[in-house]
Structures are given as structure tokens and as C-alpha cells.
């Protein structure tokens, strides 16, 4: 079957990094500069991605693979293939339309991205606050007052919260 297909479609013999050139009797021509083909049998080469401005080149384009971008210092990638760059903030801040703003009292952010999240409410688990929260760190919950007796189990900090979805631009 493969042999038959090759006889019927000469383009199937063109490897990655080339294209099947209709203008030249369907021979395999190398991809022109700034273009690539990542699979065989392609009739055109794709234009290489260019990383400009806040985007910078992480991996150069080759004849068989597209360029890859990341973000310049002070920004981080978002989206598939780093389609967007978002400004970093400091820990203890979140990004708003007006720039980086400190977390309000009772909330924290331990990353350079994302939004401020409420401190854990220890009392919901019947525990007490062992270490107070800050803008950068969640509270640490300890055993409930009733559990504070000799031989009580050691403190377990809360599981890290997953970054919530709705982060301001």
C-alpha cells in the first residue's frame, strides 16, 4: 500500500524540512529561509514564528521546527506556546489594570503571578492559628486548643492552594 501511495503521490516522499514544489514538477524543495515543515509530505512550509518586543526567542526556528518564544525578564508566559506575556509582580502583590497592588489584609500571594487568595480559616477545621498570615504567606494552622497537651502531634501546614482561574490582566 505504501508503495502504491508513493507512486500516486510523489509528495509523500518529501521529508520534514522540505515541501513538495508544484512549480517544479512536484520535486522536494528545501523550505525557504524563515520557514519550516515539521512533517513529511507537506505542499507548503509554514512561516517561522518571530519573537519580538516583550517576547524573546527561546529556541531558534529550524527547517524542521518552529521557533519558540518566552518572555523578557519581568514577565512570564501564558497560554499555549507562550502566546502571551504577563507582567510579574512581587510576592504579596497581584496584577491589576493599574499595575501591581499589595494584597489586601486577610489575603496573600506567594508567587510572582496570580491573584491574592484569602488566608486559610483554621477554625473551619477546628484548628487554631499557629503562625499569623502575611501578604506573602498563608497562616499556619495548628492543633485546636484542646489538643495542646504533652505528646500532641506536630503541626501540619495546609496544602498549597491551586492558583485560581481569574487573574487580572
Amino acid at each position: 500500500f505504501e508503495r502504491t501511495r508513493s507512486l500516486q503521490d510523489p509528495c509523500s516522499n518529501c521529508p520534514a524540512g522540505t515541501f513538495c514544489d508544484n512549480n517544479r514538477n512536484q520535486i522536494c524543495s528545501p523550505c525557504p529561509p524563515n520557514s519550516f515543515s515539521s512533517a513529511g509530505g507537506q505542499r507548503t512550509c509554514d512561516i517561522c514564528r518571530q519573537c519580538k518586543g516583550v517576547f524573546r526567542t527561546r529556541k531558534e526556528c529550524s527547517s524542521t521546527s518552529n521557533a519558540e518564544c518566552d518572555c523578557t525578564p519581568g514577565f512570564h508566559c501564558l497560554g499555549a506556546g507562550c502566546s502571551m506575556c504577563e507582567q510579574d509582580c512581587k510576592q504579596g502583590q497581584e496584577l491589576t489594570k493599574k499595575g501591581c497592588k499589595d494584597c489586601c489584609f486577610g489575603t496573600f500571594n506567594d508567587q510572582k503571578r496570580g491573584i491574592c487568595r484569602p488566608w486559610t480559616n483554621c477554625s473551619l477545621d477546628g484548628k487554631s492559628v499557629l503562625v499569623n498570615g502575611t501578604k506573602e504567606r498563608d497562616v499556619v494552622c495548628g492543633p485546636s486548643p484542646a489538643d495542646l497537651s504533652p505528646g500532641a502531634s506536630s503541626v501540619t501546614p495546609p496544602a498549597p492552594a491551586r492558583e485560581p482561574g481569574h487573574s487580572p490582566q
Epitope: R49, S83, E163
Partner: antibody, heavy 116, light 107 residues
């Protein structure tokens, strides 16, 4: 061929919420972005936000912050956009679009009408 | 937010005419610009991405050029199916924004 199929038209009253679905099929990859764009009658399209199908990361335009929730159901290959506290100004067609760089594949659109 | 301004807002042309639509960004967006065609009651359709790259399946009579803040969409020879509204859109910084559109009508 990638296809995005959206849920049907909705009529809502002011203050209500609407939730629109966008099912992806065809040559979809493990990790791509679904964007939501709305278009009021006679107006330019307006970008609302996006979600990444791989890690669920999402961002919304500040204009809709606090009113829009975008989610992704991996098992159903479906994105959802919920808009709350609707007003008459939210009337329009809502599109989902897949992006591999530009918005290269679009859903057919969902008309949302908000009136009392 | 980056404001995208298209000119003209509308134009009348005949089949076979060469049509040029311009788009200006309020700040530099390098080559992060796309052009879409939209027909009444339909979703936008990607024509050009990264300023000058023709989307697969789009006729070669469409071309794009420019960089920085000023961009152009050209239709070399207008066809009956090209009468529609055209939008530019920047993807350099969020929120992604669109131009107000250029309606191409039959003269």
C-alpha cells in the same frame, strides 16, 4: 479539521447569568487555548478572556473581571463561559475561538438577548 | 489597552478593483497583528496572521504588510465573495483588541 460547536441562543432578564458551552472536536491538541469574544450588534468584536486546555490557566479582560468565569472540561473537550449580572448591554453574539497564535478556528456563535 | 483604529470605516468598490485598508495601533505591536473577514451573521474568518502571513486556504489576492503601529490589508483584485467587513486585531498585549471594522460594499 478542528470544529468548535457552541450551545444555542439564550434569552435572559437583567441580573441573571448565562452559561455558554463550546465543544471542540477534530484535530485538537493536548494543549491549546480557547478564547471568548463577544460582538454587540453593529459593533467590533470584543475579547473577553481565554482558558488553556492543558492546565486550566485562565485570564479575563479587566472589563469583565468578577462577572465572567471560564472553565474547561477535559473529559468532554468543552469550554464554558459564564457571564453574571447581565444587563441589556450584554446583548450580542458570543463566540469561542481556538488559538494557536491567532484566532484560527471559531465557533458559530451564540446569540444572547438580555431584556426585561 | 491598545486601541486599534481602521480607515476607512467603509468603502465602495467594484469587482476587479484593488482595495487597501489601513490599521493603526495606539502603541507599537511589532508584527502581532491579524486580519479577519466577517460576513453578516457569521463568525470572523482569519485571513492574515503575524502581519503578512496568509492563513492556509485563503486566496493569494489577500496580502498584509506593516510593522510597529501602521499596518495594511490589500485585496489585489476584488471578487464578488470579498464584499464583507474586515477587522484588524492585535495580540501583542492583553486585552487583545480589534479595530472598529471596514465595510467593503459593492459600488
Amino acid at each position: 479539521q478542528v470544529q468548535l460547536v457552541q450551545s444555542g441562543a439564550e434569552e435572559k432578564t437583567p441580573g441573571a447569568s448565562v452559561k455558554i458551552s463550546c465543544k471542540a472536536s477534530g484535530n485538537t491538541f493536548n494543549n491549546y487555548d480557547i478564547h471568548w469574544v463577544r460582538q454587540a450588534p453593529g459593533e467590533r468584536p470584543e475579547w473577553m478572556g481565554w482558558i488553556n486546555s492543558g492546565n486550566g490557566d485562565t485570564r479575563n479582560s479587566q472589563k469583565f473581571q468578577g462577572r465572567v468565569t471560564i472553565t474547561w472540561d477535559t473529559s468532554a473537550s468543552t469550554a464554558y463561559m459564564e457571564l453574571s449580572s447581565l444587563t441589556s448591554e450584554d446583548t450580542g453574539v458570543y463566540f469561542c475561538a481556538r488559538a494557536e497564535g491567532p484566532l484560527d478556528y471559531w465557533g458559530q456563535g451564540t446569540l444572547v438577548t438580555v431584556s426585561s | 489597552d491598545i486601541v486599534m483604529t481602521q480607515t476607512p470605516s467603509s468603502l465602495s468598490a467594484s469587482v476587479g478593483d484593488r482595495v487597501t485598508i489601513t490599521c493603526r495601533a495606539s502603541q507599537g505591536i511589532y508584527n502581532y497583528l491579524a486580519w479577519y473577514q466577517q460576513k453578516l451573521g457569521k463568525a470572523p474568518n482569519l485571513l492574515i496572521y503575524a502581519t503578512s502571513n496568509l492563513q492556509s486556504g485563503v486566496p493569494s489576492r489577500f496580502s498584509g504588510s506593516g510593522s510597529g503601529t501602521d499596518f495594511t490589508l490589500t485585496i489585489s483584485s476584488l471578487q464578488p465573495e470579498d464584499f464583507a467587513t474586515y477587522y484588524c486585531q492585535q495580540s501583542y498585549s492583553t486585552p487583545w483588541t480589534f479595530g472598529q471594522g471596514t465595510k467593503v460594499e459593492i459600488k
